[in-house]
Amino acid sequence: VLHYVVCFPALTEGYVGALHENRHGSAVQIRRRKASGDPYWAYSGAYGPEHWVTSSVSCGGRHQSPIDILDQYARVGEEYQELQLDGFDNESSNKTWMKNTGKTVAILLKDDYFVSGAGLPGRFKAEKVEFHWGHSNGSAGSEHSINGRRFPVEMQIFFYNPDDFDSFQTAISENRIIGAMAIFFQVSPRDNSALDPIIHGLKGVVHHEKETFLDPFVLRDLLPASLGSYYRYTGSLTTPPCSEIVEWIVFRRPVPISYHQLEAFYSIFTTEQQDHVKSVEYLRNNFRPQQRLHDRVVSKSAVRDSWNHDMTDFLENPLGTEASKVCSSPPIHMKVQPLNQTALQVSWSQPETIYHPPIMNYMISYSWTKNEDEKEKTFTKDSDKDLKATISHVSPDSLYLFRVQAVCRNDMRSDFSQTMLFQANTTRIFQGTRIVKTGVPTASPASSADMAPISSGSSTWTSSGIPFSFVSMATGMGPSSSGSQATVASVVTSTLLAGLGFGGGGISSFPSTVWPTRLPTAASASKQAARPVLATTEALASPGPDGDSSPTKDGEGTEEGEKDEKSESEDGEREHEEDGEKDSEKKEKSGVTHAAEERNQTEPSPTPSSPNRTAEGGHQTIPGHEQDHTAVPTDQTGGRRDAGPGLDPDMVTSTQVPPTATEEQYAGSDPKRPEMPSKKPMSRGDRFSEDSRFITVNPAEKNTSGMISRPAPGRME
C-alpha cells in the first residue's frame, strides 16, 4: 500500500454516480467533485456504510437498497410483463467510455438505449453502467442477492426518463424517479466473449480516475439470455446520497463470466483517504451491506413460463446462463509445514464460496523435481473434516509444489488453490513473487517495487541442521479445466531454482503449462505411477482472449496530463506493478492462459493397478526417484498404525511396493468405487441449475473436529 500526504481537504470526494461537466465537449462525465463539498465516503472504515447517514441522511431511510430477495415471499405482479428494450442490440459507438471512479468502474453510455414495460412509468434512457464485485476467486461481490445467494459481480444499469429531465444528474438532484437494472455475473468455466470489450476496458482503467474508450459491445449481450424472470421493488441508490428514487429491476438469471475475466475486476485500484493520508489500494468488496425491506413488497414478473421451467434450455447452452460449472471458489490459506526431516504437512481452509455444496473431498496434487526428473502425484483426501494431508518420504533435495482442489458431491471441482513451493536444503528463499505471462519461462531478479508479499509469509524451519524453506506462489493457476502436459516441477527446474539463489528474487514466469492437462475426476480412486511428462512452453498454450497483439486503448480517453505512465501489457497483466498487493487475498491471481483443451483427448488413460480403494499402507514406488512419496491424510483422531522408524508417530507410513504390484486389500476397502480417471471433465451433476444454491461459508461452521475418519493413504495417483 502506498501512502502519501494530500493537501486538499479530506472530505471532498464525489459520489460514485456524480455525472456532470463536459468531456472533450461531449455529454456528461463522472468526475470527483473535489471542490463541491460532496461528502467523502468509502466501503469500509471510518467513512464506511454505517457512517454514510452522517453526511447523507437518506442513507438511513426505510426504503434503501440493496436487499436480499426471498423468492417465496415475492408476489407475482401482473403489471410486470415483458421488458421492451430498444437499441440494446446495436453495437456501441466508439465514444462509449469507461472510468475508474475510485468506488466503481463506470461505463458512460453514449448511444440511445431505452427500456419500457416492467411497470416503469414511461420510457427510460440508459445513462451508465456500474459494477460491484468481491475480493478474489469468485467471492461474493453482488449487492443484491436472491434467497441469500450472492454472486461474484453485479452489474447495474441506470436509467432516467428523458421526457421529464434533460439529464440523469438532473433527475437525481431533483429526487425524481430513475430506473436501475441489476444483473448478476456468475462464474463459468469459459470466458464469455460478450464481456471482452469490458474486460479489455478494465485493463485500461486500473488506476483511480483512469478513463478509456471501449471497443464496441452489444449491451443486450451483457444481459441474461432470458429476460422474462425478474424482480421489481422500489429502493434507493446503493451509494451516497442513497436517494430513495430507484425502481429496481433485478434479473433472476445470471450472466457467465470466467475466473480469468473476474481477475480484471480484482486488479482495479483505488485511492483511499484516512485523515490527510491517501493510500493506493485494490478496489475490492465495493458493495453496500444489505438493507431491511421494512414495509416494501418485492414483486416478480408475470411473464408466462419464465419462472417454471427447469432451466434445461439454458443448460444446453455451452456457457450456460447460470454459469458456474465449478464446485466452489478455491481452497484458501494453503500452508506447507515440515513435520520432520522427511515429511511435510499440507493444510488449507475451506473455500469461501461453495456453489454446489457440500464439498465431499479434496484432491491434493504435488509435483517435484530432482535431477531433471519431474514427477506428479494426485490423491483424493476423503471429506472435509481434517483439512490437512501428510506427504511422507520427502526428499530433502527436491523442489515441491502443492495445490489443492475441492470436490463437490456432484463431482464438480473447484478452481485450484494457490500453489505452494517447498524447497529443502535451501537457506535463500523468495521474498516475494510476481506472476507474469511471458512467452518463454525465465527467471530473473525482480525489483523491490515489483514484489508482492507472500500470503503465508516466508518461513524457514530447521531440523538436525537441514533447513527447509517454502514460499507460496501467487497464482490462481486457472480453472480446473486448464493445464497442460508439463509438471510444475519441469518449469521450476529451469526457472525457479535459479531464483532461489537470489535474495528477494522474483519469479518472472509461471506459465499455464506447468500442470498436466487432465487430472483424474473426483470419483477416481486409483493411483498410478506418476510418469514424467514433457515440458512445454507457454507458446503451446492457446492464447487468452485478451492476448491479442494490439495495444490497449489505455489512456486514450484521459485528459492532458493524465496519460498512463506505462501502458498495459498485451496480455493484460496488472498495470500497477509497482504496488505491492494488500494482503493474502490479493495473491490468488491468475497469471496464466488456459492451455488448449484439445490435448485432453490425446493423452492415454492410465489403467488402475487394482479396482480397490488404495490399501492402507500400500503405495507404488516411482521409478527414477529413489525414495517414494507417500501422501496420507493426517488423522489426528485415531485409527493410526504404528509409525515407521524415524517418522513422526502421528503419521501413517507405508510399505514400499514394486511399481506393478496391486494394492493390498484391507478391511473396508470399497470395490465399488470407480478407480479409473475419467476423460470426461465432469462425470455427473455437471448441469448447473439457474436456481442452484451456493453456500458462503460461515467461519463459525469451520469446525475441524470430526467423526469418522478414513486414514487410508488417499487414493494415490
Epitope: N147, I359, S383, D384, R409, S669, F688, E701
Partner: antibody
C-alpha cells in the same frame, strides 16, 4: 409452512413398477435437495437416493439400475420410480429434505411416509 | 460401501445419562448426523455435523466424535426419549456418492 408429503403407496405385485411422488410446499426444489429413504417393517432406515437442487440424481449402490429419481420444479414434485419390485421392497417410503451445508448433508425435514406393500 | 455399526439396543434408567455409539468400518471423514424415530412416526433430526443441535432439540442431546466413532449422549433420560436412534453420514462424490444409515439402536428407558 414448509413441508412435504409422499403419495403413490399401496399394494403392488412383484415385477411391477413403483412410482411414488413427493410433493413439497413452502420451499423450492430449485434450491433444495430431496432424499428418498425407506424402512421395511421392523427394520432400520435405508437410503435409496437423492436429487439435488440442480437436478443431479444420486443412488444407493443397491438401487442403481432400477431406481430413477426425477423432479418437476414447476409442480413442486419429486418422483421415485422403482422397477421390478419384489417382496423385499415392501416398506414405508419417506422423502426427506436435505440440509446441505458447506461440508455436510443431513435430512432435516421428513414426510410422514407412504406404505408400499408388494404381494402377489 | 462403508458400514455404520450401532448397538441393537441399549437400556438406560430414567434420569441417567446414556451414550449411543456409531462406528464406521472404514473411516469416512464426513460428518455424522443422528435421527430419533418413535414408533409409527417419521424420523426427526437430532444432531448434525457431529455436534450441532437443530433448534427445538433439547440440550440434553449432544453429539461428539473421535476417530471412527460418533457418539450421541442423552443426559437425564426421560420416558419420552424411548425411541430408535439412527446415525448417518455421507461419502464419495458423483456416481459413488452414498448416504448411509447405521442399523439403529433401540433405546429403552426403564424405571
Amino acid at each position: 409452512q414448509e413441508q412435504q408429503k409422499e403419495s403413490g403407496g399401496g399394494l403392488f405385485k412383484p415385477t411391477d413398477t413403483l412410482t411414488l411422488t413427493c410433493t413439497v410446499s413452502g420451499f423450492s426444489l430449485s434450491s433444495n435437495a430431496i432424499s428418498w429413504v425407506r424402512q421395511a417393517p421392523g427394520n432400520g432406515l435405508e437410503w435409496i437416493g437423492a436429487i439435488d437442487n440442480s437436478g443431479s440424481a444420486y443412488y444407493a449402490t443397491w438401487a442403481k439400475g432400477r431406481s430413477t429419481i426425477t423432479r418437476a420444479t414447476n409442480l413442486n414434485t419429486v418422483t421415485l420410480k422403482m422397477t421390478s419390485v419384489t417382496a423385499a421392497d415392501t416398506a414405508t417410503y419417506f422423502c426427506a429434505r436435505e440440509d446441505v451445508r458447506a461440508d455436510s448433508i443431513d435430512l432435516n425435514m421428513w414426510g410422514p411416509g407412504t406404505l408400499v406393500t408388494i404381494s402377489s | 460401501s462403508f458400514v455404520l455399526t450401532q448397538p441393537a439396543s441399549v437400556q438406560v434408567n430414567l434420569g441417567q445419562t446414556v451414550s449411543l455409539t456409531c462406528t464406521a468400518d472404514t473411516l469416512s471423514r464426513s460428518y455424522a448426523s443422528w435421527y430419533q424415530q418413535k414408533p409409527g412416526q417419521a424420523p426427526v433430526l437430532l444432531i448434525y455435523r457431529d455436534t450441532s443441535r437443530p433448534s427445538g432439540v433439547p440440550d440434553r442431546f449432544s453429539g461428539s466424535s473421535s476417530g471412527n466413532t460418533a457418539t450421541l449422549t442423552i443426559s437425564g433420560a426421560q420416558a419420552g426419549d424411548e425411541a430408535d436412534y439412527y446415525c448417518a453420514t455421507s461419502d464419495g462424490s458423483g456416481s459413488s456418492y452414498q448416504f448411509v444409515f447405521g442399523g439403529g439402536t433401540q433405546l429403552t428407558v426403564t424405571g
